[in-house]
């Protein structure tokens, strides 16, 4: 997760847009990835690379467990 | 309306440091980045850098050398700009700006004049 | 660091006719075909008033003599028809990224 991450922030060279999407990192199990962008006010770009960064990680981490539970099986 | 009002004149020697204020208004004061500006006498537009006040994010011209802070304190709507160790080339106006979009500076301040002199 | 090239440094001008000033980047400031530079027009004692954002988008109040264009690393500010208020200093200026770099300016008189 960490390594796609980094890869993703590192095309965005403003360091506002490059938080905004470590931001969307975070997890938050009571919203989605578009209800917490849509609170953002600071410009699209921010919304943007928020959005990209929350649903690559909500995805890996979605395939991660799905993984664990086949393991489990 | 927007506005962003700037503190007066100053005039401080060298070695000493500068604080300039920015008291932001006709906005939601958290919403948009501000930036710091300078221009020398006869010379053109400097970036020192900028803070999102919602989150505190800063980041600074690497030409201050560590020399620049910038703060907020969103209870009264002002940003703040710290120079220190003043040197005499360090004379100039000193501007605040309110970014849109993460784009373009569509609001400046008057601009404060510092002075720097033995 | 991004440096932005301003040209010419200082121009003359008569009343009617067309200003053109370029503004080079030393590298693309195209993000997925957004164009982060913008023009700001500056007359002495007062701070910088923004022109045109986006290369070529002209801000509200902004009289349509003045125009952008230009993308990737060229762009263009063009005055036409000057008129004598727009003797003042231009600046171009670019928020691709970190550090926010300023072009040297371009001092327009009119004749």
């Known amino acids: 997760l960490q390594e796609k991450i980094e890869e993703i922030a590192a095309k965005y060279k403003h360091l506002v847009v490059k938080k905004c999407c470590y931001d969307g990192v975070r997890i938050n199990h009571d919203e989605t990835c578009e209800q917490r962008a849509a609170r953002i006010s600071v410009g699209p770009r921010c919304v943007k690379a928020f959005t990209e960064c929350c649903v690559v990680a909500s995805q890996l981490r979605a395939n991660n467990s799905h993984k664990d539970l086949q393991l489990g099986r | 309306q927007v506005q962003l009002v700037q503190s007066g004149a100053e005039v401080k020697k060298p070695g000493s440091s500068v604080k300039v204020s920015c008291k932001a208004s006709?906005?939601?004061?958290?919403?948009?980045?501000i930036h710091w500006m300078r221009q020398a006498p006869g010379q053109g537009l400097e970036w020192m850098g900028y803070?999102?006040?919602?989150?505190?994010?800063?980041n600074y011209n690497e030409n201050f050398k560590g020399r620049v802070t910038i703060t907020a304190d969103k209870s009264t709507s002002t940003a703040y700009m710290e120079l220190s160790s003043l040197r005499s080339e360090d004379t100039a106006v000193y501007y605040c700006?309110?970014?849109?979009?993460?784009?373009?500076?569509?609001?400046w301040g008057q601009g404060t004049t510092v002075t720097v002199s033995s | 660091d991004i440096v932005l090239t301003q040209s010419p440094a200082s121009l003359a001008v008569s009343p009617g006719q067309r200003a053109t000033i370029t503004c080079k980047a030393s590298q693309s400031v195209d993000y997925e075909g957004f164009n982060y530079m913008n023009w700001y027009q500056q007359k002495p004692g007062q701070p910088p008033k923004l022109l045109i954002y986006?290369?070529?988008n002209l801000d509200s109040g902004v009289p349509a003599r003045f125009s952008g264009s230009g993308s990737g690393t060229d762009f263009t500010l063009t005055i036409n028809p000057v008129e004598a208020e727009d003797t003042a200093n231009y600046y171009c200026?670019?928020?691709?990224?970190?550090?926010?770099?300023f072009g040297g300016g371009t001092k327009v008189e009119i004749k």
């Open positions: 200026q670019q928020s691709n990224e970190d550090p926010y770099t």
């Open positions: 700006a309110r970014e849109r979009n993460l784009e373009y500076f569509d609001y």
């Open positions: 006709g906005y939601t004061f958290t919403d948009h980045i």
């Open positions: 803070i999102y006040p919602r989150e505190g994010w800063t």
């Open positions: 986006a290369a070529s």
